[in-house]
């Protein structure tokens, strides 16, 4: 049975040209995290493998930095970066947990971080 929950940075906003940290945290499970994938729609941004470290997809190498921790830093933001981002936790023996973050990139200088909130886990097994 999957008991874990993913806490994320929730709905966040940032200024065009700036940077933002996407962060998720898996709790309430003793499952081993084997890999975390960061995704935007059908695009794979990055993989953090527990044994092998980080792989940033070549499409994003110039604007994405690994970390902090299992998080991801997006740099040189544009309005086109507005949208949903997902952290996919691959775990053993539980399976897959998914967290969602919505990022809004603003033209103006008014950009505030949303509060952290929990998202129920998705029951995806491999």
């Amino acid at each position: 049975m999957m008991t874990g929950t993913i806490e994320t940075t929730g709905n966040i906003s940032a200024e065009k040209g700036g940077s933002i940290i996407l962060q998720c945290h898996l709790s309430s499970t003793t499952a081993q995290v084997t890999q975390v994938n960061w995704e935007q729609q059908d695009q794979l941004l990055a993989i953090c493998n527990a044994d092998l470290g980080w792989h940033i997809s070549p499409s994003f190498k110039d604007r994405v930095a690994p970390g902090p921790g299992l998080g991801l830093t997006l740099q040189s933001l544009t309005v086109n970066d507005t949208g949903e981002y997902f952290c996919i936790y691959h775990t053993y023996p539980d399976g897959t947990y998914t967290g969602r973050i919505f990022l809004e990139v603003l033209e103006s200088s008014v950009a505030e971080h949303g509060a952290r909130f929990q998202i129920p886990h998705h029951h995806h097994h491999h």
Partner: antibody
Framework: EVQLQESGPGLVKPSETLSLTCAVS????????WNWIRQPPGKGLEWIGY???????YYNPSLKSRVTISRDTSKNQFSLKLSSVTAADTAVYYC??????????????WGQGTTVTVSS | DIVMTQSPDSLAVSLGERATINCKAS??????VAWYQQKPGQSPKLMIY???YRYTGVPDRFSGSGSGTDFTLTISSLQAEDVAVYYC?????????FGGGTKVEIK
Amino acid sequence: EVQLQESGPGLVKPSETLSLTCAVSGYSITSDSWNWIRQPPGKGLEWIGYISYSGNTYYNPSLKSRVTISRDTSKNQFSLKLSSVTAADTAVYYCARLDFSNYGGAVDYWGQGTTVTVSS
Amino acid sequence: DIVMTQSPDSLAVSLGERATINCKASQNVRTAVAWYQQKPGQSPKLMIYSASYRYTGVPDRFSGSGSGTDFTLTISSLQAEDVAVYYCQQYYTTPWTFGGGTKVEIK
């Protein structure tokens, strides 16, 4: 340039343990990921597992109970042991390097492969 | 495990013509797909990674496309030296898995 060379017995008896070694030159096995992949005659590729730069291992769950991958950093080589073999383990066995940082799980350097036949 | 299904099993194309190989993943693998070329009696060679990026030294007649579950390797103008078996592979999650291969021959 990275070069990998497999070695080991070409014939193994059923129920025995298959043992192969991969000698690596031109690159240190304390960097990147070092893999074993096999190809049964006339069939596709099956990934067996890896040993990472730090010595951590991951095995394909389909073979996990029978597989051990280890390394000898002083000789810059890594090894595969597959126990309780059957005819279904007859294959060409490749050792391979994977540069995860640049290419993810895509394998960029392969050994020439060594044929292992399981037969009494 | 994620199953990678290639089609067709074999393909005969005239020299200079286009060859198209398809690969379908059993679940969404985003862009975590590689393609390999294996000539008779040789080990596989990496051709494409991250679905569409050519590996060092790969001729530009080879291109990869797709995301999600459907991927394509295209040889824009088949040359005699392209005769080989081509394999797709997913590395979205372990265990990394390969397709069954597509044999490309000259018509």
